[in-house]
């Protein structure tokens, strides 16, 4: 029997002879829709952020992560109407008065153009045209989103 | 050029020559450590339990959902030093006056022996020999989980 | 295993009300919208309402709206249709209904039994 | 609302025969449509999603096709178990709207 610090909390000794490749998906599973290097699944129903993050997250997904205006773009073609608001990974930081994205990065200011307060419980949402600031508790659509190909060397250290 | 509307939000037709299988991951990455059907990453650094949820959504996996007491033995175990904490994803939901995964299942009051108090802005965080209660603005490690084998057909019901 | 069971059923006289309960166990209710589906005797299925999995989101079929109300309460792994104003076409087997995947109203991969609604003087 | 047509509304078949159902969307909706299928006195069962999406425990002689405002439900080799009634229903826009049913019944 092994001491629990022989095991150790994140034992690397056993990765070894693991692959160093995330294996990643080669399709989208159904229900998803592939977007360059991504999976995008657009829900039909209704959560508030909290819950939206934690649908993806049960779904081993993330609330979209958008990383420039191209993007953001190619992404709103995909939404058939404009009424629809999806919400994204992106909420308001109180603590650090700045909108932050849930892999822990800040919004590069020139990416997206927020239409709404950056206030407490403001998380943002994007329409077939525009990017909104909403209430956290409003009850909208989502976007999960999986990394589609293998990523080599991706260790996933802490954010 | 496609209408948005046959475009649609999620173009299931793309998926018709996919897999319906979800290919899940065959071995753990590098710094996740195998247990049984589950490949774990126990962070370094510390969240509040918010931030540890979208961290572990990023990673594209879910804060440890702990199914039973024999899970929660062996999780502790690869747990290093006993004044070590690890937020998992369970929280209090006031609403319910209940403790809840994040998957949205109650908790088998049978599973865990919490020690602290079930009120508003409580977060379940696991030790090397307890469970505990704790403020969830409180900065402790998190662990995130992903599921190891393919699963046939799955089209991410309930974890 | 998915079960989910109707009751509230019975004989009204149109005009009148009843309240239809559809109790959810083997999934995480709170986690997925629910629908209640019609189907009037020897006739096809008719979608009637959905709510959201929070429960602050109601979607209704024109011929129930302003008349029937649903809700949930997900403590108690409930989802409920009150049904006002009954006419002799709300006649019919009610199920409740939830779909394949959380992110979705529809696609409905488990299904009560039913509860029939008979409204007749 | 979109409305879905059914064809044929009965079919008589024998055991072993392929039965082929349509669908037809009054506009388009992607891939959003599933099959169920019902018998006499029971709830529906789900066979197939997404149009093509074979249910967990569905045989595989069930097999859906289509996109946009036109799809089919084929069951490859009829089995004394699959006389019932089928429905499509679509999912893309709200409300839900399922098609008037096809009785298959034996021959």
């Known amino acids: 029997q092994k001491s629990s610090i022989e095991k150790c909390s994140v034992d690397i000794q056993q990765s070894r002879n693991k692959t160093t490749e995330r294996p990643g998906l080669l399709n989208c599973p159904i229900y998803w829709q592939q977007l360059r290097e991504k999976c995008l699944l657009f829900s039909h129903t209704v959560n508030p952020w909290n819950n939206s993050l934690a649908d993806c997250s049960t779904k081993e997904s993330s609330l979209l992560l958008i990383r420039d205006k191209d993007e953001l773009i190619h992404t709103q073609n995909l939404i058939r109407d404009k009424a629809i608001l999806f919400w994204i990974g992106l909420n308001f930081s109180l603590s650090e008065k700045n909108w932050k994205w849930i892999n822990g990065s800040f919004l590069n200011s020139n990416d997206l153009e927020i239409r709404g307060d950056a206030k407490e419980n403001s998380c943002i949402s994007i329409s077939q045209t525009s990017v909104y600031s909403e209430y956290c508790s409003t009850e909208i659509r989502w976007i999960c989103q999986k990394e589609l190909t293998p990523v080599r060397n991706k260790v996933y250290p802490d954010s | 050029q496609k209408s948005s509307i046959e475009k649609c939000s999620v173009d299931i037709q793309q998926s018709r020559n996919k897999t319906t299988e979800r290919p899940g991951l065959l071995n753990c990455p590098i710094y996740w450590q195998q247990l049984r059907e589950k490949c774990l990453l126990f962070s370094h650094t510390v969240n509040p339990w918010n931030n540890s949820l979208a961290d572990c959504s990023t990673k594209e996996s879910s804060l440890l959902l702990i199914r039973d007491k024999d899970e929660l033995i062996h999780t502790q175990n690869l747990i290093r030093d006993k004044a070590i904490l690890f937020w998992i994803g369970l929280n209090f939901s006031l609403s319910e006056k209940n403790w809840k995964w994040i998957n949205g299942s109650f908790l088998n009051s049978n599973d865990l022996e919490i020690r602290g108090d079930a009120k508003e802005n409580s977060c379940i965080s696991i030790s090397q020999t307890s469970v505990y209660s704790e403020y969830c603005s409180t900065e402790i490690r998190w662990i995130c989980q992903k599921e190891l084998t393919p699963v046939r057909n799955k089209v991410y019901p309930d974890s | 295993e998915v079960q989910l069971l109707e009751s509230g059923g019975g004989l009204v006289q149109p005009g009148g009300s009843l309240r239809l309960s559809c109790a959810a166990s083997?999934?995480?209710?709170?986690?997925?919208?629910m629908s209640w589906v019609r189907q009037a005797p020897g006739k096809g299925l008719e979608w009637v309402s959905a709510?959201?999995?929070?429960?602050?989101?109601?979607k209704y079929a024109d011929s129930v709206k302003g008349r029937f109300t649903i809700s949930r309460d997900n403590s108690k792994n409930t989802l409920y249709l009150q049904m006002n104003s009954l006419r002799a076409e709300d006649t019919a087997v009610y199920y409740c209904?939830?779909?394949?995947?959380?992110?979705?109203?529809?696609?409905?991969?488990?299904w009560g039994r039913g509860t029939l609604v008979t409204v007749s003087s | 609302d979109i409305q879905l047509t059914q064809s044929p509304s009965s079919v008589s078949a024998s055991v072993g025969d392929r039965v082929t159902i349509t669908c037809r969307a009054s506009?388009?909706?992607?891939?959003?449509l599933a099959w169920y299928q019902q018998k006499p006195g029971k709830a529906p069962k789900l066979l197939i999603y997404?149009?093509?999406g074979l249910q967990s425990g569905v045989p595989s002689r069930f097999s859906g096709s289509g996109s946009g405002t036109d799809f089919t439900l084929t069951i490859s080799s009829l089995q004394p178990e699959d006389f019932a009634t089928y429905y499509c229903?679509?999912?893309?826009?709200?409300?839900?709207?399922f098609g008037g049913g096809t009785k298959v019944e034996i021959k």
């Open positions: 209904a939830k779909p394949l995947d959380s992110s979705l109203w529809a696609d409905f991969d488990a």
């Open positions: 083997g999934f995480t209710f709170e986690r997925y919208a």
């Open positions: 709510i959201s999995a929070v429960g602050g989101t109601t």
């Open positions: 506009q388009g909706i992607s891939s959003w």
């Open positions: 997404a149009a093509s």
């Open positions: 229903q679509q999912a893309s826009y709200l409300p839900i709207t």
